[in-house]
């Protein structure tokens, strides 16, 4: 009689996470009598996966009935595979005794687990940045196996090239993580832009996962200011407007100064949105010129999104006017119809208002 051999026909088996893995093992003889055990790994630290003789192995079922007469098939099925199950599995024949002793081992079957990467999470800088600045975005995805993975960056569909990617750990592991940092140069038109991180992996069947970040969360477009003097609306009254153009985000506070003294402060509320996602706003000031002997320096001061204020000034020429009674102390008419703010429609105005 030829000596028993333990046959593990599959050198390797690959299984998707969540599925069952079938590990094949047959013996070539009924002799010697004794049980089969399955181990993951070899040597003293090997992990018992199944013991025909004794123990409770809730995830393991035998493919053949072990009580079947002349049974020589000791294949097992392991349910609900996770990346932690990866490794080399050995089918080992034991010889009956007190205790049973190891008789012969199979050559082993390497189980690899295909695990999908988690949805990529893209995060941008903590603070907003202005156009022409370079900002960094990170993309992370975890829990995938095998290690091979492809990551790409896009901005509005255009592939980016300035990025660095690491897959960890470097050595063998049950599952892996990817971390990538991309550098993006902001432009004034980026309010509606998106940065996309795309991850391709064998488990995704050609349908990559994407994570996105909206540059609206990252960009700050500072306003441009223009102060203009409108034609005289009524005798002794001048309408001065401050046009605040192309800003983002909307958070903006405007202060009028007359000769350096605060005249009025207001917060942008009803604004106009441009096609590029930036906003426009206009504020006006009615100045009663008869109240002034000298020229008036009008300043439109804007604090945008908590940044240091920017301002634009306009010198209002005051001609020699006869004094009118009752108005000698008034530099401004405070009637509600004569002060306030208005939408200013830019060339690329979307022609609708935003009420926040």
């Amino acid at each position: 009689e030829e000596e028993l051999q333990v046959i593990q026909p599959d050198k390797s088996v690959s299984v998707a996470a969540g599925e069952s893995a079938i590990l094949h093992c047959t013996v070539t003889s009924l002799i010697p009598v004794g049980p089969i055990q399955w181990f993951r790994g070899a040597g003293p630290a090997r992990e018992l996966i199944y013991n025909q003789k004794e123990g409770h192995f809730p995830r393991v079922t035998t493919v053949s009935e072990s009580t079947k007469r002349e049974n020589m098939d000791f294949s097992i099925s392991i349910s609900n595979i996770t990346p932690a199950d990866a490794g080399t599995y050995y089918c080992v024949k034991f010889r009956k005794g007190s205790p049973d002793t190891e008789f012969k081992s199979g050559a082993g079957t390497e189980l690899s687990v295909r695990a999908k990467p988690s949805a990529p999470v893209v995060s941008g800088p903590a603070a907003r940045a202005t156009p022409q600045h370079t900002v960094s975005f990170t993309c992370e995805s975890h829990g995938f196996s095998p290690r091979d993975i492809t990551l790409k960056w896009f901005k509005n569909g255009n592939e980016l090239s300035d990025f660095q990617t690491n897959v960890d750990p470097v050595g063998e592991s049950v599952s892996y993580s990817i971390h990538s940092t991309a550098k993006v140069v902001l432009t004034r038109e980026d309010v509606h832009s998106q940065v996309i991180c795309e991850v391709a992996h064998v488990t995704l069947q050609g349908d990559p996962l994407r994570g996105t970040a909206n540059l609206s969360e990252t960009i700050r477009v500072p306003p441009t200011l223009e102060v203009t003097q409108q034609p005289v609306r009524a005798e002794n009254q001048v309408n001065v407007t401050c046009q605040v153009r192309k800003f983002y985000p909307q958070r903006l506070q405007l202060t009028w100064l007359e000769n350096g003294n605060v005249s009025r402060t207001e917060t942008a509320s009803t604004v106009t949105e441009n096609k590029d996602g930036t906003y426009n706003w206009m504020s006006w000031l009615l100045v009663n010129v008869s109240a002034h002997r000298d020229d008036v320096k009008l300043t439109c001061q804007v604090e945008h999104d908590g940044q240091p204020a920017v301002s634009k000034s306009h010198d209002l020429k005051v001609s020699a006017h006869p004094k009118e009674q009752g108005s000698n102390t008034a530099a401004e008419n405070t009637g509600s119809n004569e002060r306030g703010s208005s939408d200013y429609k830019d060339d690329d105005d979307k022609h609708h208002h935003h009420h926040h």
Partner: antibody
């Protein structure tokens, strides 16, 4: 280590029934057949029947088909043999034995239960 | 059913000599290249103990002075050299079909 525990003795009246137990330990009960063997005093061994505890499949010696009924309780790892309509000819030692190689052999034996049928 | 006939029914062997017990089956007990014959030893007041399985394979813990041989229908258990502790009754059993036992052979040591 494998152990099969059987009560030492059972005294029963003629015509009655007796249910013999065999409690298994030291191995996975459902993975190996249990055999039952009869031995009358001073006589040889007679194979009665066998049961697969995993699914209660049974094989009987035709001679004992109407005499013995095998069952198992997987929750307590115990095999049972009920003997019915007892007569003096049923007085014997009854062994349970475990088949460790699925060869329909008897690798490990209990110590046996001595059944005496007497009025 | 396959009937197993053991012979002799009893024998006495001197210490250190060879004991030979025969078991003949009414038809072949071979299947798939294996001979489904098993040998047991039983001492008084004890359950039987498996000695040899599949005709010629020594069970664990059984001394090498026990050996089995044969195929088809004719099988032999040999004990050599016999020791005092070998005094017992020996049974053959087949499992080619449902199991049956031979009638037993009682071995005495002289």
């Amino acid at each position: 280590q494998v152990q099969l525990q059987q009560p030492g003795t059972e005294l029963v009246r003629p015509g009655a029934s007796v249910k013999l137990s065999c409690k298994a330990s030291g191995y996975t009960f459902t993975n190996y057949w249990i055999n039952w063997v009869k031995q009358r005093p001073g006589q040889g061994l007679e194979w009665i029947a066998m049961i697969d505890p995993s699914d209660s499949e049974t094989h009987y010696n035709q001679i004992f088909k109407d005499k013995a009924t095998l069952t198992v309780d997987k929750s307590s790892n115990t095999a049972y043999m009920q003997l019915s309509s007892l007569t003096s000819g049923d007085s014997a030692v009854y062994y349970c034995a475990m088949d460790y190689g699925s060869l329909y052999a008897m690798d490990y034996w209990g110590r046996g239960t001595s059944v005496t049928v007497s009025s | 059913d396959i009937v197993l006939t053991q012979s002799p029914a009893s024998l006495a062997v001197s210490l250190g000599q060879r004991a030979t017990i025969s078991c003949r089956a009414s038809k072949s007990v071979s299947s798939s290249g294996y001979n489904y014959i098993f040998w047991y030893q039983q001492k008084p007041g004890q359950p039987p103990k498996l000695l040899i399985y599949l005709a010629s394979n020594l069970d664990s813990g059984v001394p090498a002075r026990f050996s089995g041989s044969g195929s088809g229908t004719d099988f032999t258990l040999n004990i050599h050299p016999v020791e005092e502790e070998d005094a017992a009754t020996y049974y053959c059993q087949h499992s080619r079909e449902l199991p049956t036992f031979g009638g037993g052979t009682k071995l005495e040591i002289k």
